[in-house]
């Protein structure tokens, strides 16, 4: 499946009315937060805020559209951010030595 893009959801006015385009909106906001701090992608202190905000966004819309969370689409987005943003992070780096469980590969709902 293609990676998330930065297309404009709901461009015909009004708010996006389905979970897929809401997820796209969450992803776009997340990318806006992450792109300026590319050099810090392996520093959990720097990326924990945008990362947890992404999760809140995905979870919030899942509830609004009466879906469970986690759900396959949200899981895919979380997986893709690991592939795009965290793939080159070494777990032995001091700044990233104790990431939350889901960054280590398990995608279960967690607390921050």
């Amino acid at each position: 499946q293609p990676l998330p893009t930065t297309g404009t959801p709901g461009s015909e006015g009004g708010t996006v009315k389905n979970y897929e385009t809401a997820v796209q909106f969450c992803w776009n906001h997340y990318k806006d937060q992450m792109d300026p701090i590319e050099k810090d992608w392996c520093d959990w202190a720097m990326i924990s805020r945008p990362y947890s905000t992404l999760r809140d966004c995905l979870e919030h819309f899942a509830e609004l559209f009466d879906l469970g969370f986690p759900n396959p689409l949200a899981e895919r987005i979380i997986f893709e951010t690991h592939q795009i943003h965290f793939a080159n992070c070494s777990l032995v780096q001091p700044t990233f030595s104790d990431p939350p469980e889901d960054v280590r590969g398990s995608h279960h709902h967690h607390h921050h």
């Epitope: 006015g13 708010t15 809140d56 919030h60 609004l64």
Partner: antibody, heavy 117, light 109 residues
Framework: QSVEESGGDLVKPGASLTLTCTAS?????????MCWVRQAPGKGLEWIAC????????SYYARWAKGRFTISKTSSTTVTLRMTSLTAADTATYFC??????????WGPGTLVTVSS | AAVMTQTPSPVSGVVGGTVTIKCQAS??????FSWYQQKPGQPPKLLIY???DLASGVPSRFKGSGSGTQFTLTISDLECADAATYYC???????????FGGGTEVVVK
């Protein structure tokens, strides 16, 4: 379903105050953000902060409110706003609101905070 | 967070006429946008959500439109009861609900 604020008071400049919002008929969930909004006498609405209703407890603040205001969930039906170093400019009616991505769908009646020496 | 800039107050209209209020967001918020009506001594009331959807119980004389950064509230067939202050809000920016516009007072003559 309703929300109600309490804790508004007349306080002196420099004082701290904690406002409490109690929800009735619903409990917090990922469907909602619980937020505080204030309105100074004769002025417009000013968003202060929101806290996610889900398990993360993530909070989101207006830039001007960071550091001096703290929003917290104290139970599944109560949220608080702690305010420190209050000044006359903080005199306002403080509203607790329930919001989601579509808008604020529940407003409390408001509680008045007056900061004066 | 988005900054919302609203039509300055006051905006005047006559009974039976039409008024238009505009709101501009500092960044694209797609359609995550609401309009509220507030009368003195009362909390605001949700009028329009999702930029163009009418909240429950709101008459169809109220119409919201726009997306991205530009939004409009049009009130047609003005009634005396429409005299109030109207606020726009970025209802979600990807992080949380946030900023309100400065408010626009509508005067009905």
């Amino acid at each position: 379903q309703s929300v109600e604020e309490s804790g508004g008071d007349l306080v002196k400049p420099g004082a701290s105050l904690t406002l409490t919002c109690t929800a009735s008929g619903f409990s917090f969930s990922s469907r909602y953000y619980m937020c505080w909004v204030r309105q100074a006498p004769g002025k417009g609405l000013e968003w202060i902060a929101c806290i996610f209703g889900g398990s993360s407890d993530n909070s989101y603040y207006a830039r001007w409110a960071k550091g001096r205001f703290t929003i917290s969930k104290t139970s599944s039906t109560t949220v608080t706003l702690r305010m420190t170093s209050l000044t006359a400019a903080d005199t306002a009616t403080y509203f607790c609101v329930r919001s989601d991505a579509w808008g604020v769908n529940l407003w409390g009646p408001g509680t008045l905070v007056t900061v004066s020496s | 967070a988005a900054v919302m800039t609203q039509t300055p107050s006051p905006v005047s209209g006559v009974v039976g006429g039409t008024v238009t209020i505009k709101c501009q967001a500092s960044q694209s918020i797609y359609g995550y946008f609401s309009w509220y009506q507030q009368k003195p001594g009362q909390p605001p009331k949700l009028l329009i959500y999702s930029a163009s959807d009418l909240a429950s119980g709101v008459p169809s004389r109220f119409k919201g439109s726009g997306s991205g950064t530009q939004f409009t509230l049009t009130i047609s067939d003005l009634e005396c009861a429409d005299a109030a202050t109207y606020y726009c809000q970025c209802s979600y920016d990807g992080s949380s609900p946030n900023a309100f516009g400065g408010g626009t007072e509508v005067v009905v003559k």
